[in-house]
Interface confidence: low
């Protein structure tokens, strides 16, 4: 009997594993994991760590197999890999496993931090960078300023952080940020604690976002007929009601300046 503790390693090149609509989703979303082999295969297996047998398998005489995870729950999150095999390889022989795909099923992403680089005190004529740092790569980051309804800036970042540059003359103020998945179905983070940028000689202070006075809710995001921004009022009763900035078109994320970009 063949009882490997992991899919047997072999010299067959690894497949690629991806997720639709995203690797970060809210509970209840239908997720499709796509395993693509570099050559036509007979069987594709979807593995989780520690599993001897595949979680799911598909017999597909082609390069692509799809695994459907219906109405996912947080328990279905975690690390996945896929392997493929050909019938002429003999029993129990699988390809090298794909790179890991981490599926995160959550109502809300972890709170980011917001820090000033080089620091929260701005000298005359000096610019300051605000770094909004989350825990996940390939997210869209949004910066808000107290008293300004619309998002101040947004960035899509391949790194788990994004840097926002503020011109020195207009830098002082109270800021917060959050991040969200770049496409629907949107998952949003909690809002960072606020960060106060001050002139030299004034003392900076930080205070919890939920108690920040004068922060206004942002206006509606740019309209996208193909997606609907989630309402967050149900779990953000205090402070900002944050909504993702939707792409200008269904097909692409447009990193051009947002519709409203005052005070920078």
């Amino acid at each position: 009997d063949i009882t490997p503790s992991v899919p047997p390693a072999s010299y067959h090149p690894k497949p690629w594993l991806g997720a639709q609509p995203a690797t970060v989703v809210t509970p209840g979303v239908n997720v499709t994991l796509r395993c693509r082999a570099p050559q036509p295969a007979w069987r594709f297996g979807l593995f989780k760590p520690g599993e001897i047998a595949p979680l799911l398998f598909r017999d597909v005489s082609s390069e692509l197999a799809e695994f459907f995870l219906e109405e996912v729950t947080p328990a279905q999150g975690g690390i996945y890999r896929c392997c493929y095999r050909r019938p002429d390889w003999g029993p129990g022989v699988w390809s090298q496993p794909s790179d890991v795909l981490e599926l995160l099923v959550t109502e809300e992403l972890p709170r980011p931090s917001l820090v000033a680089l080089p620091g929260p005190v701005v000298g005359p004529g000096a610019n300051v960078s605000l770094r909004c740092a989350g825990r996940l790569r390939n997210m869209s980051f949004v910066l808000y300023r107290e008293g300004v309804a619309a998002p101040l800036q947004y960035r899509h970042s391949a790194q788990p952080w994004a840097d926002f540059t503020l011109l020195g003359a207009r830098a002082p103020g109270t800021y917060s940020c959050y991040y969200h998945t770049p496409s629907a179905p949107y998952v949003l983070s909690q809002r960072s604690e606020v960060l106060v940028i001050s002139w030299e000689g004034e003392g900076p202070e930080a205070r919890p976002a939920s108690s920040a006075p004068g922060m206004q809710a942002p206006g509606p995001p740019p309209s996208d007929p193909g997606a609907q921004a989630p309402s967050l009022s149900s779990f953000r009763p205090r402070g900002l009601v944050l909504q993702p900035l939707l792409p200008q078109t269904q097909d692409s994320w447009d990193p051009a300046p947002p519709p409203s970009d005052p005070g920078v």
């Epitope: 047998a53 979680l55 398998f57 005489s61 029993p91 129990g92």
Partner: antibody, heavy 120, light 107 residues
Framework: QVQLQQSGAELVRPGTSVKVSCKAS????????IEWVKKRPGQGLEWIGV????????NYNEKFENKATLTADKSSSTAYMQLSSLTSDDSAVYFC?????????????WGQGTLVTVSA | DIQMTQSPASLSVSVGETVTITCRAS??????LAWYQQKQGKSPQLLVY???NLADGVPSRFSGSGSGTQFSLKINSLQPEDFGSYYC?????????FGGGTKLEIK
């Protein structure tokens, strides 16, 4: 040694359902697929479907997709097949089998079979 | 679905003879084929897997050959316990189908 022990013969009425069990022993239940096969008198073998007892993942022969439901109980190392809306065509011996290969191929170990008779 | 055509449907032979049963797939299935023996009132038994590999405990008088679409099971020097029905089964894409069977009877 590997053993698959199936439930006893069933005499059932048309239109009702029946649940056949297959208790596994002698190996790690969640490490191997359990297959189900139908054998009608004087006819050949038909593959019904397969379940991964570890995950509950299933693959069915389309012909049986609305007829058979495969489940597994890890705590008792038992696989089940429920047959619904029974007709005389469902009268057959049903076998469970375990794959030789951990990913579900080559039916190396078989249960003794369960005779299901559908009769008014 | 892939169709498996087995021949002959029945065969009447004597102990000590050699027989060959063939199985043809409706499309290429590489070496992805198994052979089973089933005796009256008993469960099937795996004889050959991956077209040519003998399962544990199967006597060496049994042998499997072929790949692609044409396969055969050969039994040398038939023994009394070899009589019964034989089935091929493919494993290339669900549903995994069996051949119609070959009934091997004593002459």
């Amino acid at each position: 040694q590997v053993q698959l022990q199936q439930s006893g013969a069933e005499l059932v009425r048309p239109g009702t359902s029946v649940k056949v069990s297959c208790k596994a022993s002698g190996y790690a239940f969640t490490n191997y697929m359990i297959e189900w096969v139908k054998k009608r008198p004087g006819q050949g073998l038909e593959w019904i479907g397969v379940i991964n007892p570890g995950s509950g993942g299933t693959n069915y022969n389309e012909k049986f997709e609305n007829k058979a439901t495969l489940t597994a109980d890890k705590s008792s190392s038992t696989a089940y097949m429920q047959l619904s809306s029974l007709t005389s065509d469902d009268s057959a011996v049903y076998f469970c089998a375990r794959s030789l290969d951990f990913d579900g191929a080559w039916f190396a170990y078989w249960g003794q079979g369960t005779l299901v008779t559908v009769s008014a | 679905d892939i169709q498996m055509t087995q021949s002959p449907a029945s065969l009447s032979v004597s102990v000590g003879e050699t027989v060959t049963i063939t199985c043809r797939a409706s499309e290429k299935i590489y070496s992805n084929l198994a052979w089973y023996q089933q005796k009256q009132g008993k469960s099937p038994q795996l004889l050959v897997y991956a077209a040519t590999n003998l399962a544990d405990g199967v006597p060496s008088r049994f042998s499997g050959s072929g790949s692609g679409t044409q396969f055969s099971l050969k039994i040398n020097s038939l023994q009394p316990e070899d009589f019964g029905s034989y089935y091929c089964q493919h494993f290339w894409g669900i549903p995994w189908t069996f051949g119609g069977g070959t009934k091997l009877e004593i002459k």
